[in-house]
Interface confidence: low
């Protein structure tokens, strides 16, 4: 079989065999090599010479196979926008940022550009657990049966009601979504009927 041509090679149909690692150079109607991640084009290809690549300078990067003549400048995560760094910039990858704890991404343009504080979940609810932290604002859902949550908080979880019998006590008032069970000593007199009353 005929050996595969290596860049640069002529291309009449304006397409290259390896779209990821080669690009079409229209002036000479040839396919040339792209530069690998972490590098840039220091000399463009010609009919007799392939692309010459050079490593990105410190504090700059290129993430993909490219035919860029410059590297992108590394940018810090902007704390004013609620972002924090989770991985530093390298020649092959931009700074990795995420929303600071207790915040969610409110503006997205290919990446998160602005974070805002998570909403509090009111008593009787908790934030639905998300696959990815910081991706969206809290979605507060009611505590499930047998659980309660008595604060306004972005992160508090519903807790199981106290089981009085486990402590050798009896139930004086049932737990609700916002309050724990009230227990009493079995020897204490029964409290007045709570129907229609307000329990403090």
């Amino acid at each position: 079989s005929q050996p595969q041509a290596v860049p640069p090679y002529a291309s009449e149909n304006q397409t290259c065999r390896d779209q990821e690692k080669e690009y079409y150079e229209p002036q000479h109607r040839i396919c040339c090599s792209r530069c690998p991640p972490g590098t840039y084009v220091s000399a463009k290809c010609s009919r007799i010479r392939d692309t010459v690549c050079a490593t990105c300078a410190e504090n700059s990067y290129n993430e993909h196979w490219n035919y860029l003549t410059i590297c992108q400048l590394c940018r810090p995560c902007d704390p004013v926008m609620g972002l924090e760094e989770i991985a530093p910039c390298t020649s092959k990858r931009k700074t990795q940022c995420r929303c600071q704890p207790g915040m969610f991404c409110a503006a997205w343009a290919l990446e998160c550009t602005h974070c805002e504080l998570l909403s509090d979940c009111p008593p009787g609810t908790e934030a639905e657990l998300k696959d990815e932290v910081g991706k969206g604002n809290n979605h507060c859902v009611p505590c499930k049966a047998g659980h309660f949550q008595n604060t306004s908080s972005p992160s508090a979880r519903c807790q199981p009601h106290t089981r009085c019998e486990n402590q050798g006590l009896v139930e004086a008032a049932p737990g609700t979504a916002q309050s724990d069970t009230t227990c009493k000593n079995p020897l204490e007199p029964l409290p007045p009927e709570m129907s229609g009353t307000m329990l403090m």
Partner: nanobody, 117 residues
Framework: EVQLVESGGGLVQPGGSLRLSCAAS?????????MAWYRQAPGKQRELVAV???????NYPDSVEGRFTISRDNAKNTVYLQMNSLRPEDTAVYYC??????????WGQGTLVTVSS
């Protein structure tokens, strides 16, 4: 003073349906983040049956999931409990509850539901 008044209880055959209502007076139910229905069968502890938040999102224990539906009409100041496919073990006094932490928990007087043939 907040008052909760339940209605809609009664005698129903197994497999039947009932709709309970809980009307609030003295305060808008919209001021309550959480509204709930509890029940208490003779000789048993009061247990949660359904809970709903201001946004209309509800939660149910496994024993009633798929059979009972809680809803709230803030304009009418009323919370409802639609109970379908009723079973004898659903027999209990059903109580409406409004939670207003840190102020306390308000309860209605209860309405009796009896499921029997």
């Amino acid at each position: 003073e907040v008052q909760l008044v339940e209605s809609g209880g009664g005698l129903v055959q197994p497999g039947g349906s009932l709709r309970l209502s809980c009307a609030a007076s003295g305060s808008s139910i919209f001021s309550f983040e959480i509204m709930a229905w509890y029940r208490q069968a003779p000789g048993k502890q009061r247990e949660l049956v359904a809970v709903i938040n201001k946004g209309g999102e509800a939660n149910y224990p496994d024993s009633v999931e798929g059979r009972f539906t809680i809803s709230r009409d803030n304009a009418k100041n009323t919370v409802y409990l639609q109970m379908n496919s009723l079973r004898p073990e659903d027999t209990a006094v059903y109580y409406c509850n409004a939670d207003a932490v840190p102020h306390g928990s308000y309860w209605g007087q209860g309405t009796l539901v009896t499921v029997s043939s």
